[in-house]
């Protein structure tokens, strides 16, 4: 199936040219979306090309400035936020990156009603997060990993926690573990939905172990950093949640909420909070290991004053194939009853779905059903269900968004977005205003991306917001690679692959052959996105073909497939792409000779297991950041899949599945081992050891090491390691320079 | 009808220890934060120590810090204060009060501490 | 830590008039975090206004709280004998909580 349409007229055909290396570096090709920042139901704000902040009415089609571009310069403002009463907006400015996505930043308040910047009681810098009550304009703060409250933005803060320390305790912000692993977030405080209330994590690091690495810099003494970082089978961060009263928040002070007694008997975690109402929250808590998540509706007593968490309001899920959920654990999103919520887990037949939970797990109606999977649910109306899937034309790479009445009976499902612009368009996200009145649709691919906007009434076009006109136009020279999405069904294992063709290919021609892997848990690779990057250009300018390929342990095609590498890492993941690579082989138009794998993170684990499986099928790849064995990663992460690295538990398999194991493997492939120093998700400690495994093997390699750089490698470093492995592969594939 | 009982002050000698008790009753103790607060002989008031509810987070005022516990067994709805390494200066009443920093609604009668050799 | 200076120190009064108390804080407090308090002779303290200027349960409505910022007042429109103590106001937005030195409400 070619996915992107042919723009190119033979006549045509010798003004067009290949992609250059330095197009990918600059970002030539690179798309741009439109997430409005909605503010009401028909409202929403926009950072236009000027940088000034300017709000849109949907209904009377009018807009305006609220905030000018010199505003924003008159402090360097990056970033913006608008208080719900619309009387103040905070500048951000200063960023300064943290980890994944935590930062530090200066913050600003702008009155609008004078047009004057708040002077008194300004806030501390540098802040590690801050946000807008969802009503009014109380500001909640953490500075100093402590949490601070203000009533007004000229008032002076009140302290609500007082016992943060860096690196050891941090209130209403995760530690580096629960911030990449669970969470997913910068913060770790949620406003209740009037602002009543303010429910904030404590996380205890004290006793976790420290990964120090050396920080080059530009002194004459490297800086060591040191992370609490706990590794597979140490100790964990020690998580409490608390909930204070913003309105006199002196006299009662935080309140511990409960944990559920079968979670508190042994290690466990605290996976997400919901607000239900301004006196009820949900609270998410799973087993250290994580098989069995417990969902908690917690109530406010007024008479006690006190969160009360009642055994009839907790909600068990539990997995007996895998770990509980797909990455994370979904979260509920609740109806207008306040009790009854949707949740997305797996059905008797192992395919996630939407399940409606009333009074218990048990008796939960589901909602959709099928051997396909819902992704997300978007908005939960009165009498809508807005969710993703990738139910359409049976893609798992797909992604459409739906619409399920859930007013009428029986409830009626639409497909709103398989139809729109079906050759572009069939990767969707979508993005909802107050009671989705108005919803945006971002499209990603496979054509080039367009962000409209709808009536979530009629589910009507109303304009484009972003349709890369641009984009379009510098593409029409460019002589992109073919795109083609297909199956392999494999010993009654279906996977799905996407292959990247040189423009002019010819099928009885051969081309080396770049597998490009991730193969990480519930991840997914071979999706209908639109991407000019590396592998574009290998495929346009170098004759390259590449392939994707989505093996076991991927996501979003059940649990069968999912499950399949519970407690056994860097088996199954491997053999796919392997068995992969033979049936391209079989294809006809590859050149066996001329294989390469290549990956980053979880894929650079799999691509060094693949280049060492001892097949004979790699002539060389190319490992960034890879995991070298389980032991050296998180603690959060490892474990969901792995178990515990215990001899009661899963030790063998953690010291089984290690590249170091399998250096005498290397001997017989080109190696390229690349590394950032200062790395503090996959350390650096990982390709250390492998090179050290090598050596001691005497297997010859080549590696590249990028001082003071993290996970991402970024900034000069990234055109220096795609030029670097540019220059690798064409050497591997004796391809001229 | 809401109580606060405050017991076991007294004299004690510089550098000796000293358990307050707060019995409570008349509401759920469970659910509040309490503090102690002292006045010196035709003193003011001054705040010593707080705790939350679940007992999970303690305060203390810095003359105090490091020579004061406070606690509470909610099961019993006594609040404590753990007197150490005890001053002349610590000589007053020590109040139980309802409360975390501040709308302290409910107080005790008050026990006399006397630190004097 | 703040310091709270009430005014004035003591404060001559008869029955029936009425007595406008002090408190200045050394830094901004507002009155979401101010609370005031009556002590008699040989009693504990006794809330009156609560954080916020709310007049806390069973507090008759002569007693009134005002004031924002740094400077705050309680009012007693007209003195009733049982009023005559000292009076203290209290913050409670920054650690440690902190009493005003007291102002003595006395008969004249």
């Known amino acids: 199936i070619v996915l992107r349409p042919s723009r190119v007229h033979n006549s045509e055909e010798n003004t067009m040219r290949a992609l250059t290396l330095k197009d990918i570096l600059n970002g030539t090709f690179s798309y741009k979306t439109f997430f409005p920042n909605w503010i009401s139901g028909q409202e929403y704000l926009h950072q236009s090309a000027d940088n000034n902040i300017v709000l849109y009415n949907i209904e009377t089609g009018q807009s305006y400035t609220i905030l000018s571009n010199r505003t924003m310069k008159s402090v360097n403002a990056s970033n913006y936020g608008l208080s719900p009463d619309r009387q103040f907006v905070y500048l951000e400015s200063d960023y300064s990156k943290l980890w994944r996505y935590s930062y530090t930043a200066t913050y600003y308040i702008y009155d609008l009603s004078n047009g004057e910047f708040v002077r008194g009681n300004e806030l501390p810098r540098p802040i590690q997060y801050l946000c807008w009550s969802p009503v009014g304009s109380k500001l909640a703060y953490v500075y100093q990993n402590n949490i601070y409250l203000k009533q007004r933005p000229g008032d002076p803060p009140f302290q609500i926690t007082f016992n943060g320390r860096e690196n050891k305790i941090f209130n209403g912000i995760p530690d580096w573990v629960y911030e990449e692993e669970m969470l997913a977030t910068k913060y770790a405080l949620w406003w209740s939905p009037n602002g009543k209330f303010l429910a904030y994590a404590e996380f205890n690091d004290t006793d976790i172990p420290v990964i120090a690495y050396s920080y080059y810099g530009d002194e004459q003494y490297p800086r060591t950093i040191n992370i609490p970082y706990p590794k597979a089978g140490a100790k964990n961060p020690v998580v409490r949640i608390f909930i204070i009263d913003t309105t006199y928040p002196a006299y009662v002070g935080p309140q511990e909420v409960p944990v559920p007694a079968m979670i508190a008997s042994s290690d466990y975690y605290f996976s997400w909070l919901t607000w239900v109402t301004d006196e009820r929250v949900c609270l998410q808590w799973l087993k250290r290991v994580q098989n069995v998540s417990v969902l908690s509706i917690c109530d406010f007593r007024e008479d006690w004053q006190t969160w009360d968490c009642p055994k009839t309001q907790e909600h068990i899920e539990e997995s007996r194939t895998g770990w509980a959920g797909g990455f994370f654990v979904s979260t509920p999103v609740f109806s207008y009853d306040a009790i009854s919520y949707y949740k997305i887990f797996s059905d008797k037949d192992g395919y996630k779905h939407i399940h409606y939970i009333k009074d218990t797990v048990e008796n939960a109606i589901q909602i959709t059903s099928g051997k396909w999977e819902a992704i997300n649910i978007f908005r939960v109306t009165q009498d809508s269900l807005f969710y993703s899937s990738n139910e359409f034309e049976e893609y798992p790479g797909r992604r459409n968004i739906y619409r399920i009445s859930i007013g009428s009976y029986p409830p009626s499902k639409k497909c709103v977005t398989c139809h729109l612009r079906k050759e572009r368009c069939q990767y969707y996200t979508a993005s909802f205003s107050d009671y989705a009145k108005y919803y945006a649709l971002v499209c990603y691919g496979p054509g080039i991306p367009i962000s409209t906007l709808h009536d979530g009434r009629t589910d009507q076009e109303i304009k484009i917001l972003e349709e890369n006109k641009e984009l379009e136009n510098a593409l029409k020279n460019i002589q992109l690679p073919k795109e083609e999405i297909k199956k392999l069904e494999v010993d009654e294992i279906t996977l799905w692959y996407k292959m990247i063709l040189p423009p002019q290919f010819d099928r009885s021609k051969k081309y080396p052959l770049l597998i490009q892997v991730y193969g990480g848990p519930c991840s997914q690779s071979v999706r209908s996105v639109f991407a000019v990057n590396w592998i574009s250009y290998l495929a346009s300018k170098e004759g390259m073909v590449i392939a994707l390929v989505d093996g076991r342990g991927t996501a979003f095609q059940g649990d069968k497939l999912l499950y399949a590498v519970y407690r056994k890492l860097g088996v199954y993941e491997v053999e796919d792409q392997i068995t992969a690579v033979r049936k391209f082989i079989e294809m006809g138009f590859i050149d066996e000779k001329r294989i390469a794998i290549w990956g980053w993170s979880y894929g650079g684990y799999v691509s060094s297991l693949a280049l060492a499986s001892g097949t004979g099928l790699f002539k060389c790849g190319i490992a960034v950041a890879p995991v070298s064995s389980w032991e050296y990663y998180a603690s959060v992460y490892t474990e969901r899949f792995m178990g515990l690295p215990t001899k009661d538990d899963n030790l063998e398999h953690y010291k089984n599945s290690t590249v170091m194991a399998r250096a005498e493997y290397f001997r017989n492939v080109d190696y390229l081992l690349i590394h950032g120093t200062a790395d503090d998700n996959v350390h650096f400690q990982n390709s250390a050891q492998i090179a050290k495994a090598l050596v001691n093997a005497q297997v010859d390699f080549q590696a590249m090491w990028y001082s003071d750089q993290n996970h991402g490698l970024s900034g000069l470093s990234t055109n220096h390691l795609y030029t670097h492995m540019t220059h690798f592969l064409k050497q591997c594939f004796s391809l001229s320079d | 009808e809401v109580q606060l009982l405050e017991s076991g002050g007294g004299l004690v000698q510089p550098g000796g220890s000293l358990r307050l008790s707060c019995a409570a009753s008349g509401f759920t103790f469970s659910s509040y934060a309490m503090s102690w607060v002292r006045q010196a002989p035709g003193k003011g008031l001054e705040w010593v120590s707080a705790i939350i509810s679940s007992g999970g987070l303690t305060y203390y005022a810095d003359s105090v810090k490091g020579r004061f516990t406070i606690s509470r067994d909610n099961s019993k709805n006594t609040l404590y204060l753990q007197m150490n390494s005890l001053r002349a200066e610590d000589t007053a009443v020590y109040y139980c009060?309802?409360?975390?920093?501040?709308?302290?609604?409910?107080w005790g009668q008050g026990t006399l501490v006397t630190v004097s050799s | 830590e703040i310091v709270l200076t009430q005014s004035p120190g003591t404060l001559s009064l008869s029955p029936g008039e009425r007595a406008t108390l002090s408190c200045r804080a050394s830094q901004s407090v507002t009155s979401s975090y101010l609370a005031w308090y009556q002590q008699g002779p040989g009693q504990a303290p006794r809330l009156l206004i609560n954080v916020g200027s709310r007049r806390a349960t069973g507090i008759p409505d002569r007693f009134s709280g005002s004031g924002s910022g740094t400077d705050f007042t309680l009012t007693i429109s007209r003195l009733e004998p049982e009023d005559f103590a000292v009076y203290y106001c209290q913050q409670g937005i920054m650690l440690p909580p902190t009493f005003g030195q007291g102002t003595k409400v006395e008969i004249k």
């Open positions: 009060a309802k409360g975390w920093f501040g709308g302290f609604n409910y």
